[in-house]
């Protein structure tokens, strides 16, 4: 056997080159046939009336033919024949690659609630061979499952991703990325997640700055509530008691002037949105006012004791469960 060919892989619409090569030529006739065994070229003559076939080279050692604007119907075995005694035959297989026609991503719901599992579908239409679909949430790769449909040698792949969403996923892109031998570079489509979540509540003591509350002083607490949608209502209540009459409520702020021991207790900031509600507690303890010492008439030794108050914040934004901010005296 001294007749050789090579298999050809070509992208739809591009040019395929078929080469019939002869080692140790003896000027025998070379012929190229299509998969239906119709003669494309006999020497340098083309009986087949398909002008997409063009002669690139003809000699006693090679018949080289180009096929332009390749379509999927051109796929198959092409036969090289050499009219020696006995005749020789070799075949080359043309494989046509078709990139996906369309890439579509579809999210089950435009807006999801934290903790929900949503289904995201990505469909790569009419490719050959079947497309491999990869999923990413931001930079993290996730695993989807694919269904593959074939019709007329073309494959439509639908990959389904089940995604449990968290509040941190809000605004993060879900990316459907295609891997296919006919696609160079990065073919992908994406949708941004919109995740609704219940408020997170934080209490900040804006006055006094050092965190020690004494009789006669003022107290100012600010409640920060962040959620999606943004909480419309932020309310202050005193747990197990009435709010002091001299307390002033202004939006997220709570002012208590001229503190006294009867103000001791737990003050709660509550916030809610359509997803749920959450709260944070501040435990107020009012200390005695500083004692004033008269100027000494004799020399004395004074020992000063410093009391430090450390603010410990314990926040739990799970709806309906207890959480607290406590001022702990050490």
């Amino acid at each position: 056997q001294n007749l050789f060919t090579k298999d050809v892989t070509v992208i739809e619409g591009e040019v395929a080159t078929i080469s019939c090569q002869v080692n140790k030529s003896d000027d025998s006739v070379i012929q190229l046939l299509n998969p239906n065994r119709q003669t494309i070229y006999f020497r340098d003559f083309r009986p087949l009336k398909d002008s997409r076939f063009q002669l690139l080279n003809f000699s006693s050692s090679e018949l080289k033919v180009s096929l332009t604007n390749v379509s999927i119907s051109d796929e198959g075995r092409y036969f090289c024949q050499l009219y020696t005694d006995p005749p020789q035959e070799s075949y080359t297989t043309i494989t046509v690659l078709v990139p996906p026609r369309n890439l579509m991503i579809d999210i089950q719901r435009d807006t999801a609630v934290e903790g929900e599992e949503i289904e995201v579908n990505c469909t790569a239409m009419a490719s050959k061979p079947a497309t491999t679909i990869r999923w990413f949430k931001g930079n993290t790769e996730l695993k989807g499952k694919s269904e593959v449909e074939e019709w007329s040698d073309m494959y439509t792949v639908t990959s389904q991703l089940m995604l449990k969403v968290h509040k941190e996923d809000d605004g993060v892109p879900v990316i459907c990325q295609v891997e296919h031998p006919a696609v160079t570079g990065n073919l992908q489509t994406q949708r941004y997640l919109e995740v609704q979540y219940k408020p997170q509540v934080h209490i900040q003591m804006t006055y006094p700055l050092q965190g020690l509350t004494r009789e006669g002083d003022a107290l100012e607490l600010t409640c920060e509530a962040i959620g999606k949608p943004q909480p419309v209502m932020v309310t202050w209540v005193r747990v197990d008691d009435e709010m002091p009459q001299h307390a002033v409520l202004s939006g997220p702020n709570l002012f208590i002037n001229n503190l006294n021991k009867t103000d001791n207790g737990t003050y709660r900031c509550e916030a809610s949105n359509i997803v749920g509600k959450a709260h944070s507690d501040y435990m107020l303890y009012v200390y005695d006012p500083p004692t004033t010492i008269p100027p000494p008439t004799t020399t004395t030794t004074t020992t000063t004791t410093t009391t430090t108050t450390i603010l410990t914040i314990i926040t739990d934004s799970r709806a309906g469960e207890e959480g607290s901010i406590r001022a702990v005296d050490h």
Epitope: G76, T93, K145, S146, V148, E150
Partner: antibody, heavy 116, light 108 residues
């Protein structure tokens, strides 16, 4: 109504050859991949080979690669399986099936027995 | 590995629910299909894709999938459901097909 009818099975000696045919009707044959699946007596199903609608792409299980050749004639709505170098463990009922993994239609099968 | 693993035999009381499972690496990427085969007959496709039933298949048959495991559930098993059940899928390369070893379902 989709119909698949296999033929060509029979008794053959080890090392021998056999050609199975599957006549298809009731659907656009050239638009669908086709497959062969076999089942040894008392055993499970084993995928053998598949071919694309145009016949341009063929796929084989490792156990038959190089010995079996799948082909089709879309003008005759017929699928073929050429089996060479047959072995005793190729003994099975051979089914032809529509498409190449979700086998939505099956023939009734043809029995191939490889024995001395 | 490109293998699918099934329990060889499962039994169910008439009218009860039974689940047949299929495990394999390829099921992380592809959905399984399920086939019912009665003695002396060709297999019949009962579930494919995420949970699709071909026409004529009763709605007591359903499919589900998680990780590397696919399940076929028959809710309210009937006497005529007694058969061998096979799962299959594309293998991880996407070019070959793999079958499970089959599960013999007995309806008591």
């Amino acid at each position: 109504e989709v119909q698949l009818v296999e033929s060509g099975g029979g008794l053959v000696q080890p090392g021998g050859s056999l050609r199975l045919s599957c006549a298809a009707s009731g659907f656009t044959f050239s638009s669908y991949a086709m497959s062969w699946v076999r089942q040894a007596p008392g055993k499970g199903l084993e995928w053998v080979s598949a071919i694309s609608g145009s016949g341009g792409s063929t796929y084989y299980a490792d156990s038959v690669k190089g010995r079996f050749t799948i082909s089709r004639d879309n003008s005759k709505n017929t699928l073929y399986l050429q089996m060479n170098s047959l072995r005793a463990k190729d003994t099975a009922v051979y089914y032809c099936a529509k498409t190449n993994w979700n086998f939505d239609y099956w023939g009734q099968g043809t029995l191939v027995t490889v024995s001395r | 590995s490109s293998e699918l693993t099934q329990d060889p035999a499962v039994s169910v009381a008439l009218g009860q629910t039974v689940r047949i499972t299929c495990q394999g690496d390829s099921l992380r990427s592809y959905y399984a299909s399920w086939y019912q085969q009665k003695p002396g007959q060709a297999p019949v496709l009962v579930i494919y894709g995420k949970n699709n039933r071909p026409s004529g298949i009763p709605d007591r048959f359903s499919g589900s999938s998680s990780g590397n495991t696919a399940s076929l559930t028959i809710t309210g098993a009937q006497a005529e459901d007694e058969a061998d059940y096979y799962c299959n899928s594309r293998d991880s390369s996407g070019n070959h097909v793999v079958f499970g070893g089959g599960t013999k379902l007995t309806v008591l």
